[in-house]
Every structure is written in C-alpha cells, then in structure tokens.
C-alpha cells in the first residue's frame, strides 16, 4: 500500500474499560494529531477505516461490524461497543484517507473484569476533596454521549462494597454525589453505576474514583521552615563534616510546586568553590501537607566555609521564605597549663581562625560537586 | 529593629585621616559581616570592603587596599572606617550596611543613613 | 573587575506608567544581581535579590528579570514613593559591584 502518515501506538492513551458494558472511543487523530474535526474531513471526502491487532497477536484485522445486535458499530469518529467482551482487548488503529492521503494512529484498549465489589486493575482518577470546606460534590466520569438527553438513566452510588444510603454526610443526587462536609474517614472509592435502556436492552457503565480528603485553602499557610532555626548553633571545627538540615512544611495546596533549595554565599550550591553534597527526602500527612527536608552536607569544613552564609529557601503557591543557618567555627577550649596557673594566660586561645584567601570572600569561580 | 547610625558629616584637610563610625542595634554585630560602600556626588556605588566582627578579619576591593581600614568594637557594636591620606577623590557619603542573612550573605538590606566626609584644604 | 553598566542615567515618567530599568554586565554574572533603591533624602533599600527574588516588605508591582548579562527591574504602576535613583549590584565576581544608577522622576 502507499505511505501513509503512521503515528504509532499512542500508549498516552490507556484505555481501558469493563467488561460487559459499553463503550464508545473517538479515534485520537482528531483530538490529538491533526488539526481538523471528522466532520471537515467527512466532507472532504475522506473516510475513517477502523482495524485491530488482538492481544498477543502480530496480526491486524479488520473489525467485524457484521456481529449479532450489532455489537461493535462504528458512528462518525466514535467506536461503539454494545457491550464489550473480554477477548475485544487488543490494538485499535483508526485510519483517516482517500487517493492522496493517509494518517492512522493505533491505541491500546484492555477489557478488565471487575469483581462484585467493584475491584479491579482500572486505573482510578483521583478527586480531591477539602476537609471541613462545605459542600463539594464529585460526579459520575465519563457518561457523556451513551445515551440521548431523553432517556433517564437511574445511578446508584457505592462507597467501596456498600450502596450510599442514610450516609451522614454524603448524599446521592443523581449524576452528583453531594459531600456535605468531607472528613479523612470519607477517603475511599466511590462507584457510580449507570443503569439506561437502549433499543430494548438495558446497559450498565461502572465508573470508579477515589476520593482523597486534603488540607483546605483556608487553612493554606506560606511555607514554614523548622530547620535551621535559631536556637540551633553548627558550631565545627575545620576537618569535621558539616551537616546542615533544612526541614520545611508546606500546606496543601492544589496544582502547587512546593521548592526547597539553599544558597551558599547567596549563590547555588554548584557556583561555589567547595565539595557539597544535598540530599532530599519527602513525607506527606493525610491531607497530603508535605515536609520536605534537603540536607546540606559538606564532608571536610574548612575555615573559609565556616565563614559562608548558609540559607534556606522555600517557595509555594503562598509565598517564598528563607532562613540562615547559623555556622560558626568552635573556638578550641583553653588548655590549662602550668602558665596558666602561675597567671601568663592560655596558651591556646582566640579564635583559631585563620585569615581566609581574599578571592574567596565573595568570589566563586570554581566548582564543585553537588548530588 | 535593625537599626544602623552612623557617625555626622567630616570636614577634612587633604593628607589627614578620618575615622567613621557606624553603630548597630537590634541585632548581633557577631552574626552578620559588615560593610563599607563610598557613593560619589552623581555617582554610583563603588564598594569598599567588609570586616568580619566575629575575628576581625578584613576584605577590601583593591582600590581601597591602601585607603581604608575597617575595624570593629563587638563591646560597643559599631564598626569602624577609617580613611588615611585623604585627597579631593575621597569625598564622598560612605555607608554602612548589614547583609540580610547570617554571615556572608551578598543581599545588603539594611543600610546606614551615610557620613559625608569633604576633604577641602 | 565586573562593569555594571546602566545605560539611562535618568528617567521621567507618569504615575500609574510600568517603568523598565536596565542593566548590564560586562560578562555573564548567572543572576547573581540586587536592585537597591535609593531615595533623595540617601536612604538606602534593598528591593530585589538574585534577580527576581522581591525582598520582604516591597510592594508587588516592583518586579525583576533577566539572565546572562541583562537584567531589568521592572515598576509596574508608578506610585509617587518610587521617585528615586536606581542600583543594580552584582555579587557573581570579587569585589561586588553596582551600577551608576537611573534616577526616576515624575513628569
């Protein structure tokens, strides 16, 4: 056959849908690959040719439409399967062409069987819902276009294994699934189950999403730094290893990039002309709040680095803050001599710290590892 | 509050030295570097040095090798600037400043209200 | 030595103009660079740090940007009290060195 424009196996888009109920999948070179509608091209008088490559198998075939109650149709740019079976898994290609054209695309589709509970390998969107915010609701995903605005589908929510019914806080309304206020004990699936008829037949869609009760925007601080504070003192001697931690707590806030980092002088850590090393950790609460800790390491602290200005810096969506560690070289301990005793004064005192090279003092052409 | 004062305006003759003062509250003189910019009628910024109060060790741009000395008295918190064989180019308003951070920090945020210093026979 | 230079050395617009002031640098200075400001009566602030970092306590409509060897502070609704003269600063090379400044007037 002539060249025709292959954008592969889009496995950006795992579909993936239960057995047993229908399902309608838009081919994605509309909606991802080309830059006009199936309609344009329809009347373009371009066709859209549907085939599949079976699970475990190098072959491709074309659809059979031709099977009992129509099962498998195909309507526009959509795919239809009245219902679904388990062996339909497999690698669906939509082909676009007419005499001089040609673009195809291919997309997984797995069939997967879910249990009485609604368990199953579906990959579940997540909702997050505010703790303690009022009302919020969730609604049923994906139903759009199944059945015509004029029929009423009855839907029956679930809460794991069990039908929503005289729930306190949570109440069925339809589509929507109402939260009066939402608690960390209201984390969980929840599952809608459409019921409508279609041409004498009666279909179900199963829709599963998980619900995670998160920290509230009114409770959402500025980030807060723990560590370093000031009533902490890395007090070193040159030779030991200096190890700074910067422990942060950021509130949980929707779509926002939680950052640490530490300046050295003022500067990145790789800009300065010493060995260091910062290693991150991450923890979050149950309503998602994080702490971040990146701790600042240098193996062998010279004099010149208990002189740096060690900061810590931390920005979200509310806000950028910043706090220095106090560094400073430990002064050696008097040793009490015979001088001493007979009144000369100590031998070993003052501040042990010699003059640093000048270029270092706010310089920082060299460089240095940073993990 | 951080607060930095310095010493009132200098009239000097050309040759003689002259001694700044800058006196700091609100804070430990120990903890924060301190630094010394001369500003020129209609001119920009041109820094000096820097004096760490904890040991006393010293920093200057080279221009001011020879020019400037910068001492400090952590007892009564005020570093020092002192000018040595003064001519008509050192005059000028010479500030103090404090990093923002602990140490060596470049962010210079809190800054003397200036000494004017006239060198004029 | 690092030359910073400011190129307008004064600047008069309206209140409620967005002001751009610029600098350069004779090399790349990786965004090591402050911007200070200096009011008539020589009180000294500092407004921006390491480019674009807004110090505490500066309204929000003062703003910095750049990279490599240009930078700009940027005034996005002139307010009476940001009648003042302007410093860049670089901290990215001993010694640390600024600008000759653009002093900002009211037209």
């Known amino acids: 056959s002539e060249r025709c424009d292959d954008w592969g196996l889009d496995t950006m888009r795992q579909i993936q849908v239960f057995e047993d109920e229908p399902a309608r999948i838009k081919c994605p070179l509309f909606e991802h690959f080309l830059k006009f509608n199936y309609s344009t091209a329809h009347s373009a008088g371009l066709t859209l040719i549907w085939y599949w490559t079976r699970q475990d198998r190098d072959l491709e075939e074309p659809i059979n439409f031709r099977l009992p109650e129509n099962r498998i149709s195909k309507e526009k740019d959509v795919l239809w399967f009245r219902p679904t079976l388990l062996n339909d898994t497999g690698n669906y290609t939509c082909m676009l062409r007419n005499t001089t054209y040609c673009s195809k695309v291919a997309f997984p589709l797995e069939v997967v069987q879910k249990d009485s509970c609604f368990n199953s390998p579906m990959k579940l969107p997540v909702h997050k819902l505010y703790i303690e915010y009022g009302i919020q609701r969730i609604t049923c995903p994906n139903v759009d276009g199944y059945f015509p605005s004029s029929v009423k589908p009855t839907i029956t929510w679930y809460m794991g294994c069990y039908k929503i019914q005289n729930f306190n806080n949570v109440i069925p309304e339809g589509m929507n699934l109402s939260f009066l206020i939402a608690f960390i004990s209201n984390n969980g699936n929840y599952t809608c189950v459409v019921t409508y008829p279609e041409n004498g037949r009666t279909f179900h869609l199963t829709r599963t999403l998980t619900v995670k009760v998160v920290g509230s925007p009114k409770n959402a601080v500025p980030p807060v730094i723990h560590s370093p504070n000031d009533h902490v003192v890395y007090e070193k001697e040159p030779g030991e290893e200096l190890l700074i931690p910067c422990t942060v707590y950021f509130s949980f806030l929707m779509d926002s990039r939680n950052e640490v980092w530490w300046t050295i002088d003022g500067k990145k850590p790789d800009d300065i002309p010493i060995d260091v090393t910062i290693n991150e950790s991450i923890s979050h609460s149950r309503t998602e709040d994080e702490t971040r800790t990146q701790i600042l390491s240098i193996k062998k602290v010279t004099s010149e680095d208990l002189k740096r200005s060690y900061v810590c810096h931390a920005r979200s969506a509310k806000g950028e803050v910043a706090k220095a560690a106090t560094v400073k070289q430990k002064v050696p301990a008097p040793r009490y001599t015979v001088e001493l005793a007979c009144g000369f004064g100590a031998t070993g005192g003052g501040s042990g710290k010699p003059i640093p090279n000048p270029l270092l003092g706010l310089d920082s052409t060299h460089h240095h590892h940073h993990h | 509050e951080v607060q930095l004062q310095q010493s009132g305006a200098e009239l000097v003759k050309p040759g003689a030295s002259v001694r700044l003062s800058c006196t700091s509250s609100?804070?430990?003189?120990?903890?924060?570097?301190m630094h010394w910019v001369k500003q020129r009628t209609e001119q920009g910024l041109e820094w000096v040095g820097r004096?760490?109060?904890?040991?006393?060790?010293?920093q200057y741009a080279p221009n001011f090798q020879d020019k400037a000395t910068i001492t400090v008295d952590t007892s009564s918190n005020t570093v020092y600037l002192q000018l040595s064989s003064l001519t008509s180019e050192d005059t000028a308003v010479y500030y103090c400043?404090?990093?923002?951070?602990?140490?060596?920090?470049?962010?210079?945020?809190?800054w003397g209200q200036g000494t004017l210093v006239t060198v004029s026979p | 030595d690092i030359q910073m230079t400011q190129t307008t050395s004064s600047l008069s617009a309206s209140l409620g103009d967005r002001v751009t002031i610029s600098c350069r640098a004779s090399?790349?200075?990786?965004?090591?660079l402050n911007w200070y400001q200096q009011k008539p009566d020589g009180t000294v602030k500092l407004l921006i740090y390491?480019?674009?970092t807004l110090h505490s306590g500066v309204p929000s409509r003062f703003s910095g940007s750049g990279s490599g060897t240009d930078y700009s502070l940027t005034i996005s609704n002139l307010e009476p009290e940001d009648i003042a003269t302007y410093y860049c600063?670089?901290?990215?090379?001993?010694?640390?060195?600024f600008g000759s400044g653009t002093k900002l007037e009211i037209k």
């Open positions: 390491y480019t674009s």
């Open positions: 609100g804070f430990n003189i120990k903890d924060y570097f």
């Open positions: 600063h670089q901290y990215s090379k001993f010694p640390p060195t």
């Open positions: 004096i760490d109060p904890e040991d006393g060790e010293t």
């Open positions: 090399q790349d200075i990786s965004n090591y």
């Open positions: 400043f404090r990093p923002l951070y602990y140490g060596n920090s470049p962010w210079f945020a809190y």
